[in-house]
Every structure is written in C-alpha cells, then in structure tokens.
C-alpha cells in the first residue's frame, strides 16, 4: 500500500514538475527589466528563451522572436538545450511511469518489470529535474554577470549634458517556476526510485525440495543462506549472460552510480 502511494505520489509530483518545466521554457519572463528605484515605467522590457517583449504603459505589448540561430549567445543556446532535454526526458519518463504504476494492470506484467520501469522513470525524472535546474541556474548566472557589468557601465554618456541609462535585467518569474519545477521533478524521481525498491520482491521463493537421506527427511530451501553467504538463486554471475540486464535483487539491493549511467 505504502509502495503504491509512494509511486503514485512520485508520478503526480513529477507530472506537476514537468508541466512546470514546460511552462518555464515557454514563458517570456526569464529576465525582466530591473526597475531599481522606479517601480512604474512607461516602457517595460522582458525576455524569454525564444523571444523578447516590450510592454508599454499604453497597454500595448510587442514581442519579437529570435529569428537567428547562429547569432544567439552560446549560453542561451545551452539553456534552451538543457530545458528541451529536460522536457523530452521527463515526457518519456512519464510515459514509462504510467505503465509502471502498480494500480494499472497491463496484461500479465510482472512486478519485477514494473519495478524496472519505475526505476527507469525515476532516473529519467531525476535527470530531467537536474537539466531544468542546471538550465535555469546557467541563465541566472548569466543575468547576474550581465547585471553587474551593466551596473558598472550604468551611466555611459556622462561627459556632457546627456545621460544614457543602460537597461539592466533581473530574474524573471520563469526562473523561479523553473527552479521549483525542476525540484519537484527531482523529488518525484527520487520517490519513484524509492517505490521501485518496494515493488521488487524481497527474494525469490521456490517450493521446498525434499531430499531423502538415511531414513529421515531434510527440507532444503535454496537461497536460504543468501544473506550470510552471498549465494542464492540470483547470483551475480547472471549478469554476464543476460546482456547487462539487472536482476531483481540488483535493482533492489545494489543501486550504485553505475546503475544510472
């Protein structure tokens, strides 16, 4: 029951997170004009990953797409790439996790298969969340750098009577949406990985086999000493023959950094 709840909650949290990542990627307010001492402005500039906009006090808003690909800063391209990778991984993760949900029965799918799918989707959500957080953080870092650079050059034309004030940009709403969404996707992914541990059977139970020796019966259950000796029905050697496919026990008991590559 707790496993189903954890898996379901992980799915829902990841779903909200991915929806947030998509929303953040599409939003125009990644960077907004810094209003410093002037909260009311006749012309307000804000920029997204795909276009820049100007809102006038008249109520008129004009947005222009970035119609160049090569002319854009490498950092912006990198942020776009990270966000898109995050969305794609998240979407695939959602698709996989739907079939992995314990409450949904598809044919005669084994719990072990569901466990593997849950782990896969969990890892995808974690990577998706990390991509979004990384993308947003790279953009935020870019903003901070540009902010202080433009502050240093704030009044560029002070030689004469003329004052040229440079437009400074600060964090837009999309950054906060992206951070929260990335965090939620990450949390959802972790929950899916935790749920996976509970989905996999503790051990494979075989029917007892009777061995008759010297007139009295001794029941021997293979795998009974697994915990203490390391031997059992699912030996580590199996990995050599199955093309690297994880056994149920490996999924459950041996998650290492190599499992996520």
């Amino acid at each position: 029951m707790a496993v189903t709840a954890c898996q379901g909650l992980g799915f829902v949290v990841s779903l909200i997170g991915i929806a947030g990542i998509i929303a953040a990627t599409c939003m125009d307010q990644w960077s907004t004009q810094d209003l410093y001492n002037n909260p009311v402005t006749a012309v307000f500039n804000y920029q997204g990953l795909w276009r820049s906009c100007v809102r006038e006090s008249s109520g008129f808003t004009e947005c222009r797409g970035y119609f160049t690909l090569l002319g854009l800063p490498a950092m912006l391209q990198a942020v776009r790439a990270l966000m898109i990778v995050g969305i794609v991984l998240g979407a695939i993760g959602l698709l996989v996790s739907i079939f992995a949900l314990k409450c949904i029965r598809i044919g005669s799918m084994e719990d072990s298969a569901k466990a593997n799918m849950t782990l896969t989707s969990g890892i995808m959500f974690i990577v998706s969340g990390l991509c979004a957080i990384a993308g947003v953080s790279v953009f935020a870092n870019m903003l901070v750098t540009n902010f202080w650079m433009s502050t240093a050059n704030m009044y560029t034309g002070m030689g004469g009577m003329v004052q040229t004030v440079q437009t400074r940009y600060t964090f837009g709403a999309a950054l906060f949406v992206g951070w929260v969404a990335g965090g939620l996707t990450l949390i959802g992914g972790v929950m899916m990985c935790i749920a996976c541990r509970g989905l996999a059977p503790e051990e494979t139970n075989y029917k007892a086999v009777s061995y008759h020796a010297s007139g009295h019966s001794v029941a021997y259950k293979p795998g009974g000493f697994k915990a203490s000796t390391g031997f059992g029905s699912n030996t580590k050697n199996k990995k050599i023959y199955d093309g690297g496919a994880r056994t149920e026990d490996e999924v459950q008991s041996y998650p290492s950094k190599h499992d996520y590559v």
Epitope: A42, S52, V54, G59, F60, V162, Q163, T167
Partner: antibody, heavy 118, light 113 residues
C-alpha cells in the same frame, strides 16, 4: 469610433477642489492607458496623470503629486481626475487622451477649462 | 525628468518649401528591448486638441500625409515637412514617451508668409 468627452471644469478658488470626468466610448476601456494632459495659457503641454493599460498603475509628475488623483470606473467607462489644493498655476485646458503604440496619444477629447482664481 | 528642447521656437515659411524642426532630449529615448525610439510628434491647430503625427520617432500615424517625416535616434530628432501646405500652419510638439513623466517640448510655431 473612439470618443472622449471631458466635463467638470470651471472656476475654483485657490486651495479648492474639482473633479474632472471623461466619458469614453468605442474601445475596451480597461485595456488602454489613459492620460490627463493640460495646456497652459502659454500653450505649454503637460501630462499631469497617467493610468496604464491592464494593470492600472498610476503616475504623476512632481508638480501635481499628492494633489491630483487619476482613477477609472470600468463599469461606467469613465476616467476621473480628482484635483485638490488647487493653485493659480493649475489654470489650464484639461484634455483626456487615450494612448496606444509607443505610448503616443492618438485620441484626444475637446478639453475642459479649469480656472483657479480668487 | 527628461527635458525636451525644441528649436526653433517659431518658423515662417512659404508654401511648397521644405521645413525641418528639431527636438533634443536630455536622455536617450532609445529602448534597447525593441530598438525603438520613444519620441512622438504632434500637430496642434488653433482651437483644436493636438493631433498625433509620428510615433516611435519615425512611424507615421495612419491618415497623416506622407510629406511629414520623422527621423533621428537617441537624443536628436527631426520632423521634416517636405512641401509645406497652407493647412500645416500650426504648433508642433515633440514628446518623450519613454520615461515618466511623459514630458513635452515647448513647441515650434509654424507660420506662413
């Protein structure tokens, strides 16, 4: 057709108050920025109050801040300018104007005259 | 506040002549966000409210004759009337529409000989 009609002007003593109204029609009132612009007897133009489109932020120059208040009644499609502590230098023809592209003012009313004199 | 300085204060010309009037702002009116200059030109005839001629420094308002041309960027702007007509006798005002307060120039009075 966009139409703006001002009313409420008149003669008032220094220190007195007056409320100007502007009846708007022919457009979605709440979506556009609106301004009160006055023209002094010396033909100088001054934008004394602005209310932005959509979010309805208000702005006033230092010469009138704290004395003038711009507001709008979306239900009645009316723009108002509440003027208090009036001074002789507030004597002018007051226009109501609607803004658009580039914060320009393509639509103006015919104006209402405010005279501040003892 | 942005100070708008118009020159000359008055002009007397003959019909058909080319006229240019200047408007200078104390601060750049160029918005980096859309690379547009937030300067507007108005024409005001006696007994009438001002009429919008040019916005964004060079965009002609619909219905305005093409003899009216706005130009300039940053702090220096010009309104040109390629061939003055009798009906162009009026006051011409420039306005900063970039930063509050939205200030006007003192105006240029155009008279016909």
């Amino acid at each position: 057709e966009v139409k703006l009609v001002e009313s409420g002007g008149g003669l008032v003593k220094p220190g007195g108050s007056l409320k100007l109204s502007c009846a708007a029609s022919g457009f979605t009132f709440s979506s556009y920025g609106m301004s009160w612009v006055r023209q002094t007897p010396e033909k100088r133009l001054e934008c004394v109050a602005t209310i932005s489109g959509g979010d309805s932020y208000t702005y006033y120059p230092d010469s009138v801040r704290g004395r003038f208040t711009i507001s709008r009644d979306i239900a009645k499609n009316n723009l108002y300018l509440q003027m208090s502590s009036l001074r002789s230098e507030d004597t002018a023809l007051y226009y109501c104007a609607r803004s658009y592209n580039g914060n320009s003012l393509p639509y103006w009313g015919q104006g209402t005259l405010v005279t501040v004199s003892s | 506040d942005i100070v708008m300085t118009q020159s000359p204060s008055s002009l007397t010309v003959t019909a058909g002549e080319k006229v240019t009037m200047s408007c200078k702002s104390s601060q750049s009116l160029l918005n980096s966000g859309n690379q547009k200059n937030y300067l507007t030109w108005y024409q005001q005839k006696p007994g009438q409210p001002p009429k919008l001629l040019i916005y964004w420094a060079s965009t002609r308002e619909s219905g305005v004759p093409d003899r009216f041309t706005g130009s300039g960027s940053g702090i220096d702007f010009t309104l040109t009337i390629s061939s003055v007509q009798a009906e162009d006798l009026a006051f011409y005002y420039c306005q900063n529409t970039y930063s509050f307060p939205l200030t006007f120039g003192a105006g240029t009075r155009l008279d016909l000989k």
